[in-house]
């Protein structure tokens, strides 16, 4: 429960939230679990801690490992673990299973596909969407806030959908992509 798997691609931004949440006033310290070395909070570092978030801007394969977060209230200290894996970018279109977020189901009445993890990032529209690596075009597809709406859903709409957006941190831009499967169910 308090160990969370997170993954990303090299040279993209990855932001990980401490799985142990506390009240906003509580402080959060982050450590490399293997060395118990504190992770810096200064934003000039490529990897730095920002309250309950650990930011990899951008991520590198060597960042993979387990990170410890300790949330401190005036009287209690509670520990969480973030298991981070950074993968090399695939040269082909195929998205391996280990990079996929949870599958979502849709129907003619409800066809929203949320972009996974986007709430952790400082992003601005537009959000780009791809299906099986092809940019989505046509009036049936509407990118709305952090999700994609498909009008008049058909069984052929099933597949892997990737959202792509830009995270901005102190004026610097970093790309983020996330992929999940979409299945179509009968009403």
């Amino acid at each position: 429960k308090f160990s969370k798997q997170s993954w990303g691609l090299e040279n993209e931004a990855l932001i990980v939230r401490c799985p142990r949440q506390g009240k906003p006033s509580y402080t959060v310290d982050w450590y490399y679990s293997q060395t118990n070395k504190s992770i810096p909070t200064q934003e000039r570092n490529r990897v730095f801690a920002s309250r309950d978030r650990l930011k990899f801007l951008p991520a590198a394969v060597a960042d993979s490992g387990i990170y410890t977060c300790i949330v401190r209230s005036p009287t209690f200290n509670r520990t969480g673990y973030a298991n981070v894996t950074i993968y090399k970018k695939q040269s082909d279109c195929n998205v391996p299973d280990y990079l996929m977020y949870s599958t979502v189901s849709g129907s003619e009445k409800n066809s929203k596909i949320y972009c996974p993890t986007i709430d952790l990032y400082n992003w601005t529209a537009p959000l780009e969407w791809f299906k099986n690596c092809q940019a989505l075009q046509g009036s049936r597809y509407r990118a709305h806030k952090s999700f994609l709406v498909i009008d008049n859903v058909m069984t052929e709409d099933a597949g892997d959908y990737t959202c792509k957006f830009i995270h901005n941190e102190n004026g610097a831009n970093y790309s983020v992509t996330a992929t999940r499967s979409f299945t179509v169910k009968d009403e």
Epitope: K1, F2, Q21, G22, K23, S73, T75, F76, R78, T79
Partner: antibody, heavy 123, light 107 residues
Framework: EVQLLESGGGLVQPGGSLRLSCAAS????????MIWVRQAPGKGLEWVSS????????YYADSVKGRFTISRDNSKNTLYLQMNSLRAEDTAVYYC????????????????WGQGTLVTVSS | EIVLTQSPATLSLSPGERATLSCRAS??????LAWYQQKPGQAPRLLIY???NRATGIPARFSGSGSGTDFTLTISSLEPEDFAVYYC?????????FGQGTKVEIK
């Protein structure tokens, strides 16, 4: 210093009603989840009900659902438990306690407890 | 609901001895388990949270261990004031549940 002081207990007939109060002091009451726990004579502890801080979401044990109502008045730093349709098996010492951590959707331990108020349901 | 079973029901020991109390959950509670001490006529007092962390002001002779379904509270050397009833509690999900208690009495 954190203090919780229950009141309102007493003898009541089966089917009757009672309202317990818990006056809190020494901490910012509104941001903490609050809980009622009871203990029947010579028995163990039983969670009765919880209420979130400012959000006010409520949770009940099956044994009291539909009969008991937990509420709070953050302006008065007071927690309440309205008990209706009381039964003999509701006889217990009722404690109010503080959850010092909870975030939405989670629970934690009880770090401060009141001294308890005895509710006796008998004819 | 998650049922917590404590054993033994009663533990008869002398001051200075080691006490080992067990709490078993009917399903995994990860480390969302606490231990409380209760003396006659008093409210419970928090000893251990998150299975193994001592609450503020609790002496080092109290320690907790375990995760998942099996947990242990150990009192390394009993002091006269440690004779009391001890309860475990899970808080992974509502309803919050307590064990039935273990009474540590003087032999």
């Amino acid at each position: 210093e954190v203090q919780l002081l229950e009141s309102g207990g007493g003898l009541v007939q089966p089917g009757g009603s009672l309202r317990l109060s818990c006056a809190a002091s020494g901490f910012t009451f509104s941001i903490y989840d609050m809980i009622w726990v009871r203990q029947a004579p010579g028995k163990g502890l039983e969670w009765v009900s919880s209420i979130r801080g400012e959000g006010g979401g409520t949770y009940y044990a099956d044994s009291v659902k539909g009969r008991f109502t937990i509420s709070r008045d953050n302006s008065k730093n007071t927690l309440y438990l309205q008990m209706n349709s009381l039964r003999a098996e509701d006889t217990a010492v009722y404690y109010c306690a503080r959850d010092p951590w909870s975030t939405e959707g989670s629970f934690f331990v009880l770090d401060y407890w009141g001294q308890g108020t005895l509710v006796t349901v008998s004819s | 609901e998650i049922v917590l079973t404590q054993s033994p029901a009663t533990l008869s020991l002398s001051p200075g001895e080691r006490a080992t109390l067990s709490c078993r959950a009917s399903q995994s509670v990860d480390d969302d388990l606490a231990w409380y001490q209760q003396k006659p006529g008093q409210a419970p007092r928090l000893l251990i949270y998150d299975a193994s962390n001592r609450a503020t002001g609790i002496p080092a002779r109290f320690s907790g261990s375990g995760s998942g379904t099996d947990f242990t509270l150990t009192i390394s050397s009993l002091e006269p004031e440690d004779f009391a009833v001890y309860y475990c509690q899970q808080y992974i999900t509502a309803p919050l549940t307590f064990g039935q208690g273990t009474k540590v009495e003087i032999k």
